[in-house]
């Protein structure tokens, strides 16, 4: 389905002239940033961005690739090198340390320099690195963490925790030796390392004593609290601040976010990770867009500004399952959250970054026709005379043999949210990929986001833009609308 106007060179020349005009008018915003927002698409490599763009366009009944994502409107773009100190292809822990703390670390370690060793508790002390969120708090800003995963998961933990093992969600996940050596589980660090104003995501079970029934699934013992120390971390957190509120469902979140007496808000909407957007119960669980809006509502009350981390954390999980439908619908919701944040903030005083921690071995190819479903088949057959999809994986659970051969695939199969795209190599879980990822930037000092950079550069851009340590002598004019 080729739009007739696109056959005319004038269409492309006019479009390019408009883009050139906009580019020539583009002026860097040279003031400091009052607010910092980092949107982290976990596993959102460039192939995922492209496929999500097409899906979002097709959701709007358009052909697909011509329809811009919210992040496509950001004027500055760079590439980020995602390798960790010890691996060509990183995980979400080492990468979170880079883009949130400004220092690269080792695989599976969080908030620690590469002098720390995975799983070795005694290498923690002295190797801690401080996140931009922590520095923003010290500067008097309000801070928040929003994610569709557990709030104790690797990416959000990079904002507040220091641990040699990303899997130490609660004390029950730690060996006794590590506990005895004084290492703290991530849930404990969430409430004790620093004062976080807004915490929204999943991860209820790591906050409550072992056997404590979950409010949403009281008869499912697998969702019970897991803590061996018997602590109620939510209660401890609430006791720290008079205006603190804890919520566990969408209705309570909406009420709390509109209540002027609420100064601190913790919302934990699932025992573990939040549900995929396609499985979410919209009466019980908020979407990422709704959580983002609630966080911004609370944080923007602070005249000194805020720091907000927002993660579309389950893009990554969909890819690990080799289920592109799940990954891409998560990516579209992630973009919806970016769009909403753009409506609620001003680029004059808010630096907004959008990036990924790493990519996935997810490919989009095979010459599909324009306007064909993103989940559809390639136009021809493969050498084995069977159909194949435009979306594929380099490895993962999508590798299946049927009578010793690759199975055929139909369009009615490939569109299912449960369908696993085929893979070249059999693995229980599809893996991350090592190519560079995009960084999109808008707002004060966004022009610094350019070229090909180390992933750790991202944290430094945020710190500099907001004149946070170590850039307190940033020599930038105050943010738009401020008078001091």
């Amino acid at each position: 389905i080729i739009p007739v106007e696109e056959e005319n060179p004038d269409f492309w020349n006019r479009q390019a002239a408009e883009a050139l005009g906009a580019a020539k008018k583009l002026q860097p915003i040279q003031t400091a940033a009052k607010n910092l927002i980092i949107f982290l698409g976990d596993g959102m490599g460039v192939s995922t961005v492209t496929a999500a763009r097409i899906l979002k366009g097709q959701k709007e009944d358009k052909l697909g690739p011509e329809t811009p994502l919210a992040m496509d409107h950001f004027p500055y773009v760079a590439l980020s090198k995602t390798y960790s100190v010890d691996k060509h292809v990183p995980d979400s822990a080492a990468t979170a340390t880079a883009y949130l703390c400004g220092v690269k670390g080792n695989f599976q370690t969080i908030g620690l320099s590469a002098a720390a060793r995975y799983n070795q508790c005694n290498t923690t002390r002295g190797n801690e690195v401080v996140s931009v969120m922590n520095r923003a708090k010290k500067a008097g800003k309000s801070v928040g963490v929003v994610t569709t995963t557990r709030v104790q998961h690797a990416s959000p933990a990079g904002a507040y925790a220091h641990t040699v093992n990303r899997n130490w969600y609660s004390d029950a996940n730690m060996p006794g030796s590590a506990r005895r050596e004084g290492c703290k589980d991530i849930a404990t660090q969430l409430i004790s390392n620093m004062d976080i104003d807004v915490i929204l995501g999943g991860g209820r079970k790591y906050m409550f004593r072992m056997g404590a029934p979950d409010p949403e699934y009281p008869h499912d013992y697998s969702q019970d609290g897991t803590r061996m120390d018997g602590k109620n971390l939510v209660q401890e957190w609430l006791a720290k601040q008079q205006g603190a509120r804890y919520v566990w469902n969408r209705t309570e979140l909406m009420q709390a976010s509109l209540d002027p007496s609420v100064t601190h808000l913790m919302g934990l909407f699932e025992p573990g990770d939040m549900k995929y957007e396609i499985h979410r119960d919209p009466t019980l669980d908020p979407s990422l867009m709704e959580m983002t809006e609630a966080a911004l509502r609370l944080l923007s009350r602070n005249p000194r500004g805020f720091f907000l981390f927002v993660e579309g954390g389950r893009i990554d999980h969909g890819h690990h399952e080799s289920r592109a439908y799940r990954a891409l619908t998560e990516a579209v919701m992630f973009d919806d959250a970016i769009e909403r944040a753009g409506q609620l903030t001003s680029e004059e005083d808010t630096l907004t970054l959008v990036t990924a921690d790493h990519s996935h071995v997810f490919s989009f190819g095979a010459y599909p026709l324009r306007g064909s479903s993103i989940f559809g088949l390639a136009p021809g057959k493969a050498q084995d005379r069977k159909a194949y999809t435009a979306l594929l994986y380099g490895n993962g659970p999508g590798y299946v043999l049927k009578d010793g051969a690759r199975p055929d695939v139909t369009e009615s199969e490939s569109g299912s949210p449960e369908y696993r795209q085929q893979a070249a190599v059999p693995l229980d879980e599809e893996t991350h990929a090592g190519e560079d990822v995009a960084v999109f930037a808008r707002g004060p000092q966004a022009h610094l986001v350019h070229g090909v950079q180390e992933q750790s550069f991202i944290a430094h851009v945020m710190a500099f833009a907001a004149c946070l340590e170590p850039y307190t002598a940033c020599d930038l004019a105050p943010p738009a609308g401020t008078t001091d």
Partner: nanobody, 121 residues
Framework: QVHLVESGGGLVQAGGSLRLSCAAS????????MGWFRQAPGKEREFVAA???????EYADSVKGRFTISRDNAKDTVYLQMNSLKPEDTAVYYC???????????????WGQGTQVTVSS
């Protein structure tokens, strides 16, 4: 998840009419494009019609001018009004849902169980 339940099928004479309904279970029904497919005995399932959330509509050439697809977002229901039915329209008719008209007309995410339509001559 979206659960789809079709109704309205039956036996009708050539030249007659039927109205199929498909009720969807998900609250965000209006975000989905909805479609109808059919499968005649011994043949592959084929696309019939689809309607996007924005109201964009597509029909298969074989039913243009005879069939009309519509939706009622308040009732989470999509309809297929079938007029001037022919014996070759005999098939099991399936309701489908997907993220946009392009997706639903080619690779639907969700399917109903189907309802039988038989057109006698």
């Amino acid at each position: 998840q979206v659960h789809l339940v079709e109704s309205g099928g039956g036996l009708v004479q050539a030249g007659g009419s039927l109205r199929l309904s498909c009720a969807a279970s998900r609250r965000s029904f209006s975000e989905y494009a909805m479609g109808w497919f059919r499968q005649a005995p011994g043949k592959e399932r084929e696309f019939v019609a689809a309607i996007g959330w924005s109201g964009v509509i597509e029909y298969a050439d074989s039913v243009k001018g005879r069939f009309t697809i519509s939706r009622d977002n308040a009732k989470d229901t999509v309809y297929l009004q079938m007029n001037s039915l022919k014996p070759e329209d005999t098939a099991v008719y399936y309701c489908a849902a997907g993220l946009g008209i392009r997706v639903v007309s080619q690779t639907p995410a969700y399917w109903g169980q189907g309802t039988q339509v038989t057109v006698s001559s």
